[in-house]
Amino acid sequence: SERCDDWGLDTMRQIQVFEDEPARIKCPLFEHFLKFNYSTAHSAGLTLIWYWTRQDRDLEEPINFRLPENRISKEKDVLWFRPTLLNDTGNYTCMLRNTTYCSKVAFPLEVVQKDSCFNSPMKLPVHKLYIEYGIQRITCPNVDGYFPSSVKPTITWYMGCYKIQNFNNVIPEGMNLSFLIALISNNGNYTCVVTYPENGRTFHLTRTLTVKVVGSPKNAVPPVIHSPNDHVVYEKEPGEELLIPCTVYFSFLMDSRNEVWWTIDGKKPDDITIDVTINESISHSRTEDETRTQILSIKKVTSEDLKRSYVCHARSAKGEVAKAAKVKQKVPAPRYTVELACGFGAT
């Protein structure tokens, strides 16, 4: 009944596990909330208590650790399911306490079903491979701690529904899957099924990830400004709308921030008084190269606006570039009644 530091429901760690498979879930307190680990807490006399709230219920209840074959157990700071059932879905709470201290956090656990081709509502991690970059590997994820190193599991790899064997450029090597030379055709979902024995029973771990083949750093270049360019002139009369697109191509670069911005007479549009709007759109190629377009628009351009300098800037991890638009005032066609008549000596 004493006060407990409640970290609430940690929805950032939405844990999804497959039905009828083992699952080991670490108490998030030690990983994300507290500055000490389980061993330190345990030796300081703190106890870790687990309980849960079933899906669509409000009632917190203790976890039943007396199920046949120890289906649910706790080991140090890990909650084990051997295996999970669909109705294990719910919010789980781990609480660390003694007579003077209490801290707890809840997290959602969702047990999901998969079909025979490994399709499921599971959110899949994405692994990016560089196109035509030489040998690259993916590793069967999140299988550590399920069996001791003395146990030699069998691992089968699938692409989509198909077992990977005699594929041209994809070779299973135990926990790793090697891509000799990654191509766009290698995009897709890859599944490893790890089978291991434990106490006379056989368990399966299914792990699916999405492979996305992206642009190689070998091909990466600084941003390329396609527009504005030297071939295009924006010739306008005062009162007309001025529309200048800045279109920039960015090579895919892992963890690079791509930026595009306009300056008018050396200032950001926000810092000047003219009525200018900028609309941005972004598209991606199949290797995740990015094209960003920022359209600068002045609804009713003035003769002053047509004398200004309009420069498009772009920056990525590969460098920074800039290009000025060629803007000029259209020379009005002569009006016969005045200009031409004067030319003919009329008064």
Partner: antibody, heavy 123, light 112 residues
Framework: QVQLVQSGAEVKKPGASVKVSCKAS????????MNWVRQAPGQGLEWMGQ????????YYAQKFQGRVTMTRDTSTSTVYMELSSLRSEDTAVYYC????????????????WGQGTLVTVSS | DIVLTQSPISLAVFLGQRATISCRAS??????????MHWYQQKAGQPPKLLIK???DLESGVPVRFSGSGSGTDFILNIHPVEVEDIATYYC??????????FGGGTKLEIK
């Protein structure tokens, strides 16, 4: 998805003019060059010129200079190609084709094409 | 103007075999880092379709049996293995500098 839809077939007399339209959708119209390419029956492809819709800037192949005019209407995302002083050898399928953007600063390819408009010049 | 010469004018190959089409430019269409040479496929009664851009980069959705190579003035389109749906006319195209684009004369591919 990107689509270029051209106007229907035309039959014209020698000396007349023809105006073919190409309506674009599925992308930001003003930011891509639009080209016109023609193909006489049983012949190869011939580039006629291009227009940049944002500014109306045009470039024409020397062969068509003075006879071709390319315009655009940004409110309807449509480009037009008008060819005047038609002669029988102008009988061809006329295609509009969009220039793509890539990691290189020039030397562009034509990534999307209209379905083509047959123009027949006959007395 | 740069002139593109394609050879052969027509080509007949067995299904599953390799088809090689060549395109020679009257002057170089390469600069540091890239070549402005592209390849298109045109089937009867259809508009051309971009296959390969910048000499060797496969366009999205194009089968990997198509490949391109070359630089400077000499370029090659390879199709291997040839399939029935590859029956078409193939054009090379250069876009060296605005505003002049030209196409090769075309190569008609047939099945033996």
């Amino acid at each position: 998805q990107v689509q270029l839809v051209q106007s229907g077939a035309e039959v014209k007399k020698p000396g007349a003019s023809v105006k073919v339209s190409c309506k674009a959708s599925g992308y930001i119209f003003i930011t891509y060059w639009m080209n016109w390419v023609r193909q006489a029956p049983g012949q190869g492809l011939e580039w006629m010129g291009q227009i940049f819709p944002a500014s109306g800037t045009t470039y024409y192949a020397q062969k068509f200079q003075g006879r071709v005019t390319m315009t655009r209407d940004t409110s309807t995302s449509t480009v037009y190609m008008e060819l005047s002083s038609l002669r029988s050898e102008d009988t061809a399928v006329y295609y509009c084709a969009r220039t793509d953007f890539y990691r290189y600063d020039g030397g562009y390819a034509l990534d999307y094409w209209g379905q083509g408009t047959l123009v027949t010049v006959s007395s | 103007d740069i002139v593109l010469t394609q050879s052969p004018i027509s080509l007949a190959v067995f299904l599953g075999q390799r088809a090689t089409i060549s395109c020679r430019a009257s002057q170089s269409v390469s600069t540091s880092g890239y070549s402005s040479m592209h390849w298109y496929q045109q089937k009867a009664g259809q508009p051309p379709k971009l296959l390969i851009k910048y000499a060797s980069d496969l366009e999205s959705g194009v089968p990997v049996r198509f490949s391109g190579s070359g630089s400077g003035t000499d370029f090659i389109l390879n199709i291997h293995p040839v399939e029935v749906e590859d029956i078409a006319t193939y054009y090379c195209h250069h876009s060296w500098g605005i505003p002049m684009y030209t196409f090769g004369g075309g190569t008609k591919l047939e099945i033996k």
